[in-house]
């Protein structure tokens, strides 16, 4: 038995920040779980990990270069990524493991979310129009 994960197909980070919501076919209330966010088609780079426990606050771990926070919903974990750079544009996959209560469960691979980080570009000021020629 596998947990299904739904993610937005694409998110655009205009202000170098984005909320990526991972929605699960499983209620996380009063569960001990590990939710994680992985970068790249092969999910090779784990960028955020959230541990949830019925008796403690969420514990959020971030990879160097990623400023990550997590928020828990009944059937979701939302990863809040800040200070993103253009070169962190990529596809990101949500993963979930539930440890307690038994049985241990994990997820079917999701379709992922493409996060497109828009660079901060200064808008060029319009040129001062010169005198029009007759």
């Amino acid at each position: 038995n596998k947990i299904l994960v739904k993610q937005s197909p694409m998110l655009v980070a205009y202000d170098n920040a984005v909320n990526l919501s991972c929605k699960y076919s499983y209620n996380l209330f009063s569960r001990e779980f590990r939710a994680s966010l992985h970068k790249g088609l092969d999910s090779a780079v784990e960028v955020c990990v959230v541990y949830g426990n019925y008796s403690q606050q969420l514990q959020v771990y971030s990879k160097t270069g990623f400023n990550c926070d997590g928020k828990l919903g009944n059937e979701s974990v939302t990863f809040y990524l800040q200070n993103l750079y253009v070169n962190q544009t990529d596809i990101y996959f949500c993963k979930i493991e539930v440890m307690y209560p038994p049985p241990y469960l994990d997820n079917e691979k999701s379709n992922g979310t493409i996060i497109h980080v828009k660079g901060k570009h200064l808008c060029p000021s319009p040129l001062f129009p010169g005198p029009s020629k007759p």
């Epitope: 590990r34 784990e46 960028v47 990990v49 514990q59 771990y61 971030s62 990879k63």
Partner: nanobody, 121 residues
Framework: DVQLVESGGGVVQPGGSLRLSCAAS????????MDWYRQAPGKQRELVTG???????NYADSVKGRFTISIDNAKNTVYLQMNSLRPEDTALYYC???????????????WGQGTLVTVSS
Amino acid sequence: DVQLVESGGGVVQPGGSLRLSCAASGSFFSIDTMDWYRQAPGKQRELVTGVTSGGLTNYADSVKGRFTISIDNAKNTVYLQMNSLRPEDTALYYCSARIRTSGGGGWSTYWGQGTLVTVSS
């Protein structure tokens, strides 16, 4: 069974430094996370910092910029470098680890006995 052994505690003056170590031993598949908690007299145990085997980190606001955590996966050991120590850092520091005892998934949480850090002039 899995054992966690802390070392490196002691007495240090305000502004000084200490380096704590926590080594995991026994029979297990892999380590997920290794964390440091602390408990001061009459206070609740609080999370100080933690690290995953992949090097992802987590710091309490009160220690950011002063404490640095690192992990040596080959030695199953976590290190806590504590700089600019303050009297309010005085506490018993406990190591905690989420450890996978088999490759089939799931983890268990283990605790060490603690090492005392006293910051006093």
